[in-house]
């Protein structure tokens, strides 16, 4: 069965069929009929119940709210309610690019090493029974492939394979023709053998701070795709409500490696935050590397040689 829509924030392209499936779809346990409701709220409108009165484009099933198709004005928050279970999603419907066979904001990027196995399979399990045909395009030019139900590319990658591959599923519903597009941006890179990950900057950093203020400790590393970067502090991570790990940022280098940075934000600095180690570690199969930060009160700066400070 198709998995439920667990992502709370969803972006879709106008004009395509779309569905939300709630995550309390335990079909085996439901014996008696259960009253269920779907609601939408957006801007001025608070919790409007969804049925064909609110939009003739929607259809309701046991676990699924379908849009035939989804349109720009469907942007908003959606709620499913059943007994004491509620699930919420934020839906953002974006404009279709009329000048291309795909919309740039709805592209999945994939990196493939040259000479390694490269595969694209056009599948859509939810709408499978309604799909008449499927076409695969490369840079918006149709590829002539044998199978027009599930077109597939399977080969060893070459640099010429780089490009935008779009799977377009054509389906009929209530006498109308719809299409669903899924696009992959395939980048072919040189053979990438793993590097030993390394944290950038000095191994020990004293950071001058003032009590009551905030500080952001930035930890950056050069690492492999599967390597991890994390912060360790105090006796038990997360025990201090003033300490927050921000979302990790990753940028790919031209060599196919990753530059990652993770910020530790300490708000309303107190005495307990001073003179303790905040350790940032990068870990890989090949080992670990750690750097440390110590917060020092600005008044105590004179006691430490100038070259060990970071700002």
């Amino acid at each position: 069965a198709e998995s439920c829509t667990s992502r709370p924030h969803i972006t879709v392209v106008e004009g395509e069929p779309f569905y939300l499936k709630h995550c309390s779809c335990s079909l085996a346990h439901e014996i008696e009929t259960t009253t269920k409701s779907w609601y939408k709220s957006s801007g001025s409108q608070e919790h409007v119940e969804l049925n064909p009165r609110s939009s003739s484009r929607i259809a309701l099933h046991d676990c699924v709210l379908e849009f035939w198709p989804v349109e720009l004005n469907d942007t908003g928050s959606y709620f499913f309610q059943m007994k004491n279970y509620t699930q919420k999603w934020k839906l953002n419907v974006i404009r279709r690019n009329k000048h291309s066979c795909f919309t740039e904001r709805q592209v999945t990027s994939k990196i493939v090493e040259v000479k390694k196995f490269f595969q694209i399979t056009c599948e859509n399990s939810y709408y499978q029974t309604l799909v008449n045909s499927t076409s695969l395009y490369k840079n918006c030019k149709k590829l002539l492939l044998e199978n027009n139900k599930n077109p597939t590319i399977k080969k060893n990658a070459e640099f010429e394979d780089q490009g935008y591959y779009s799977c377009v599923h054509f389906l009929h519903h209530n006498g109308k023709l719809f299409n669903i597009t899924k696009t992959f941006n395939i980048t072919i890179v040189e053979d990438r053998s793993n590097i030993v990950p390394v944290l950038l900057g000095p191994k020990l950093n004293h950071v001058a701070v003032e009590l009551g203020k905030n500080v952001r400790l930035n930890c950056s590393a050069l690492l492999n795709e599967e390597d991890v970067i994390y912060w360790m502090f105090g006796e038990e991570n997360g025990s201090d409500p003033n300490i927050h790990e921000e979302k990790e940022m990753r940028i790919m280098t031209p060599e196919g490696k990753w530059h990652a940075s993770k910020v530790l934000r300490i708000e309303n600095i107190g005495e307990s935050n001073l003179n303790v180690l905040y350790n940032c570690t990068v870990a890989s199969t090949g080992g670990t590397d750690t750097k440390s930060f110590i917060l020092v009160r600005k008044a105590d700066m004179a006691d430490i040689p100038g070259h060990v400070f970071t700002r």
Partner: nanobody, 123 residues
Framework: DVQLQESGGGLVQAGGSLRLSCAAS????????INWFRQAPGKERARAWD??????????YYADSVKGRFTVSRDHAKNTVYLQMNSLKPEDTAFYYC??????????????WGKGTLVTVSS
């Protein structure tokens, strides 16, 4: 011959109850969601259902105007769907139609329609 047949309509006083039935012949009702639509006197048939039950019978959906008063159920063995209507109001007076479709959806998407049964609620 494929058809849907509603029954159970009639005259009832405000606050009273009625149970409508929707029986299928020539096809299996269990393969479809059953939607109940109404057509008030002198008006077009509504494009949106008042109540709907999915093909599995696990889920029921109701319009705000009938929520808490109407209950939809189905008996797979009898190939029949029921609409139990309680606390009826004069504004519920209408022809009631059952329709079979792939989902609880707009009138234009339904595959089969019944001929309707009249419910009259007097004050």
């Amino acid at each position: 011959d494929v058809q849907l047949q509603e029954s159970g309509g009639g005259l009832v006083q405000a606050g009273g109850s009625l149970r409508l039935s929707c029986a299928a012949s020539g096809f299996t009702l269990g393969a479809y969601a059953i939607n109940w639509f109404r057509q008030a006197p002198g008006k077009e048939r509504a494009r949106a259902w008042d109540a709907c039950i999915t093909s599995s019978g696990r889920s029921a959906y109701y319009a705000d105007s009938v929520k808490g008063r109407f209950t939809v159920s189905r008996d797979h063995a009898k190939n029949t769907v029921y609409l139990q209507m309680n606390s009826l109001k004069p504004e519920d007076t209408a022809f009631y139609y059952c329709a079979a479709g792939a989902a609880c959806a707009a009138a234009g998407t339904m595959n089969y329609w019944g001929k309707g049964t009249l419910v009259t609620v007097s004050s």
